[in-house]
């Protein structure tokens, strides 16, 4: 099966790489604009230059193109804790990230929020915090993992999943209760 091509892709595929088909004259292939520029006017004829103009401040194109307008620079989302890693240039969008000792939680493909890496108090670091993943903790004896924090087994209710991890402690408490009743 031949993959379905969009009109623009179909038109581009007629021309060699780095060129695109003139929208008004499909016998002319125009040279694409370099990154950092956009298409102001199509080339007037074969072998003639495409009129490309540099992107204005606050906009960019990251690859060769025949866009009529540059793309608007992204803004880092302060409400998500994001910080600017590198500012927007004519040929590269803003790069947003998190502060040191934070990781990204992606709500969706293009939206992330910064969260503090877990410190593994009352436990040890099993896997270090990474750009897109929180620290993985292993808890000391007498503690169980709840929402990536080591919580004392004294907070373990019998109905919770912690009962297996805290079984010796629960049995000990039960044992002392039993010994008090005899």
């Amino acid at each position: 099966l031949v993959p379905h091509l969009g009109d623009r892709e179909k038109r581009d595929s007629v021309c060699p790489q780095g060129k695109y088909i003139h929208p008004q004259n499909n016998s002319i292939c125009c040279t694409k604009c370099h990154k950092g520029t956009y298409l102001y006017n199509d080339c007037p004829g074969p072998g003639q230059d495409t009129d490309c103009r540099e992107c204005e401040s606050g906009s960019f194109t990251a690859s060769e193109n025949h866009l009529r307008h540059c793309l608007s620079c992204s803004k880092c989302r302060k409400e998500m804790g994001q910080v600017e890693i590198s500012s927007c240039t004519v040929d590269r969008d803003t790069v947003c990230g998190c502060r040191k000792n934070q990781y990204r939680h992606y709500w969706s493909e293009n939206l992330f929020q910064c969260f503090n890496c877990s410190l593994c108090l009352n436990g040890t670091v099993h896997l270090s915090c990474q750009e897109k993943q929180n620290t993985v903790c292993t808890c000391h004896a007498g503690f169980f993992l709840r929402e990536n924090e080591c919580v004392s087994c004294s907070n373990c209710k019998k109905s919770l999943e912690c009962t297996k991890l805290c079984l010796p402690q629960i049995e000990n408490v039960k044992g002392t209760e039993d010994s008090g009743t005899t």
Epitope: H105, W107, S108, E109, N110, L111, Q113, F115, E147, N148
Partner: nanobody, 120 residues
Framework: EVQLLESGGGLVQPGGSLRLSCAAS????????MGWVRQAPGKGLEWVSM????????YYADSVKGRFTISRDNSKNTLYLQMNSLRAEDTAVYYC?????????????WGQGTLVTVSS
């Protein structure tokens, strides 16, 4: 068919509390982050809060931090928003929303909304 049905809105005095609920159906609730969005009269949409599948990650708009609490009950396919210390500026239609995993938009499905009016 994805369905999100909000309830719990109403008229409340400033300083009062309300708890909104959202019953979800038509998709695997436990696979998706969920959120609440609101639209005040004559204003645009504002993200209020979001929660991930396990409830470990939450987001709150600065305007509601410390007053609102988002939670979910995966066994009941229900999302909640506990709203305390309500203010007049919290008056809005509140929408429950399913968060999209892909694409440019954070939310891909919305409920019909429930109206919250804060007035003395």
């Amino acid at each position: 068919e994805v369905q999100l049905l909000e309830s719990g809105g109403g008229l409340v005095q400033p300083g009062g509390s309300l708890r909104l609920s959202c019953a979800a159906s038509g998709f695997t609730f436990t696979r998706y982050s969920m959120g609440w969005v609101r639209q005040a009269p004559g204003k645009g949409l504002e993200w209020v809060s979001m929660i991930d599948v396990g409830g470990r990650h939450t987001y709150y708009a600065d305007s509601v931090k410390g007053r609102f609490t988002i939670s979910r009950d995966n066994s009941k396919n229900t999302l909640y928003l506990q709203m305390n210390s309500l203010r007049a500026e919290d008056t809005a239609v509140y929408y429950c929303a399913k968060i999209s995993q892909f694409g440019p938009n954070a939310f891909d499905y919305w409920g019909q909304g429930t109206l919250v009016t804060v007035s003395s």
